[in-house]
Interface confidence: medium
Amino acid sequence: IPVIEPSVPELVVKPGATVTLRCVGNGSVEWDGPPSPHWTLYSDGSSSILSTNNATFQNTGTYRCTEPGDPLGGSAAIHLYVKDPARPWNVLAQEVVVFEDQDALLPCLLTDPVLEAGVSLVRVRGRPLMRHTNYSFSPWHGFTIHRAKFIQSQDYQCSALMGGRKVMSISIRLKVQKVIPGPPALTLVPAELVRIRGEAAQIVCSASSVDVNFDVFLQHNNTKLAIPQQSDFHNNRYQKVLTLNLDQVDFQHAGNYSCVASNVQGKHSTSMFFRVVESAYLNLSSEQNLIQEVTVGEGLNLKVMVEAYPGLQGFNWTYLGPFSDHQPEPKLANATTKDTYRHTFTLSLPRLKPSEAGRYSFLARNPGGWRALTFELTLRYPPEVSVIWTFINGSGTLLCAASGYPQPNVTWLQCSGHTDRCDEAQVLQVWDDPYPEVLSQEPFHKVTVQSLLTVETLEHNQTYECRAHNSVGSGSWAFIPISAGAHTHPPDEFLFTP
């Protein structure tokens, strides 16, 4: 490690004094110190002499001697004070640039160590420091502002008390650069707007960023609007707000509005659409078919989409019959708002009963009037079958009645033996009745059909079965002739309970 003579950490001299600093090392040595006038340098092998015969306050600073060839990089230092009664400060740099949250060293060096007790840091023009400015002072190095913030980008002066009065240094400009994450954040309110001609409207475009240097504007279609800007600063963000107030809207105000903000990192934009209408409107629609078919016992949700302006003043679901005067339970009706002008209304019908088939109407009202949308709900049933033996026009006839929805198809089977249900091996004959007679077909009710099978003579060791089926299921009835008369067998499983 090099050695400096005089071997003291600090040296205090008066202006005009001669100062000689000698550094001796094992190999060649080099001096490093503040850039200042009047120094002469003399090197002789392993020693180097720095000297001046006219020291000034500008020579105040720390002089370091290093040995470039030393692998350990050892150095020695001495701090020189040139105490000038008129110049308490030696400012090494008048501009300091740091990034936010770094420490910023303002290099005003005190020329007299005795003055340390009375030093302070102020902003130029006597302004106090920003609140939360955390700083420390070292007479060798100056003032350090710890974890500098962008807002602390100011001009500073170092102040020292000399003989009861404050003496300021020349100013040091601190530039604290923000680390800007990206373009400004944007909001455009509302996301969509509808107004009747003549009404008032307001559109608010606001942008915020950690840095004050950004631009924001609002444009209508492709025209930039001239709107006064309101500025604010909170939550450590700069905010710029443009508010467009329209007292009486007209059709020319309609169209696309874009809020655009930009900074050095780039541009952000967001848009909304403004509709101007002649009068109030109320539109009801459904993505579902208005004619619904559901199997009995299952559930159904009826959904209505409403587009309205102004907002709804009333709405409800109504059951229009034909079965009973029951009304949908309010707890089964549900409303969700997609956005300001569009809503979805849902009626839940769980585990549908036969008496719940019929017409359901959704009614809504706004200043534009009443509107209704009606659903027709028909329940599907698997067929129920019954067979009787009768004489028609003197001929023995098997009469099969089948009831269900949709309309059942009828098939007759004749099979050998007595059985509850004909299976393939037993079948002797099959007759399809493509056009059974419709006995009843009222809306929302089951369809009842009748099929006749004329039988000249009943074979007593045989079974006659009427089968009916539709899209929901099937039903059957087995007729077994007995010498003592006809015997019928409805299938065990068909005890229909909705």
Partner: antibody
Framework: QVQLEQSGAEVKRPGASVKVSCKAS????????MHWVRQAPGQGLEWMGW????????NYAQKFQGRVTMTRDTSISTAYMELSRLRSDDTAVYYC????????????WGQGTLVTVSS | DIVMTQTPLSLPVTPGEPASISCRSS????????????LDWYLQKPGQSPQLLIY???YRASGVPDRFSGSGSGTDFTLKISRVEAEDVGVYYC?????????FGQGTRLEIK
Amino acid sequence: QVQLEQSGAEVKRPGASVKVSCKASGYTFTGYYMHWVRQAPGQGLEWMGWINPNRGDTNYAQKFQGRVTMTRDTSISTAYMELSRLRSDDTAVYYCARDLEGGGPFDYWGQGTLVTVSS
Amino acid sequence: DIVMTQTPLSLPVTPGEPASISCRSSQSLLDSDDGNTYLDWYLQKPGQSPQLLIYTLSYRASGVPDRFSGSGSGTDFTLKISRVEAEDVGVYYCMQRIEFPSTFGQGTRLEIK
């Protein structure tokens, strides 16, 4: 909530000194500069100077230099303003005011202390 | 020192009507370093201490109604009250703090007609 409670009214002879106190509560006393502003009867506002309660460093308006001394006692969160060599035109209400961010604005004010200088 | 001049010195206003107070400085209050304009507005209601209304040209202080707004640039500034209410009576002061000593305008007395 933030409060600045000042000492009571004073009547002084010309040439005397007066020391007005300002006790802060509801916030960290050392975190905000304190300013002193005065208002002569029926007149406007006049800034006198500031003190940094954290370090005690001060800055006075040139008009009051040599006559005013601003001090603080952090243990009791109190700032003081002493004005010496009083003259009759020093008769005024003296306000302490908290500095919001350093160099103003003054977001909270004391209720004021009336100092009357009369022979 | 920077001289602050307010006009008018007295302002009679009908409740619900707007009001405007002007303030002029003898030199620019714009700090070219940070882009801020160091002008504040205070209201001193009768028998009370001053209270902060607007700071750094246009920022409303906490709790101040949005009917108060500040604007201007360089050396000419305006405080606007969109709809005056009875509680707004008092003396309004502008204050510069671009450099110390801070200086105040002479005040504008707002009274209800």
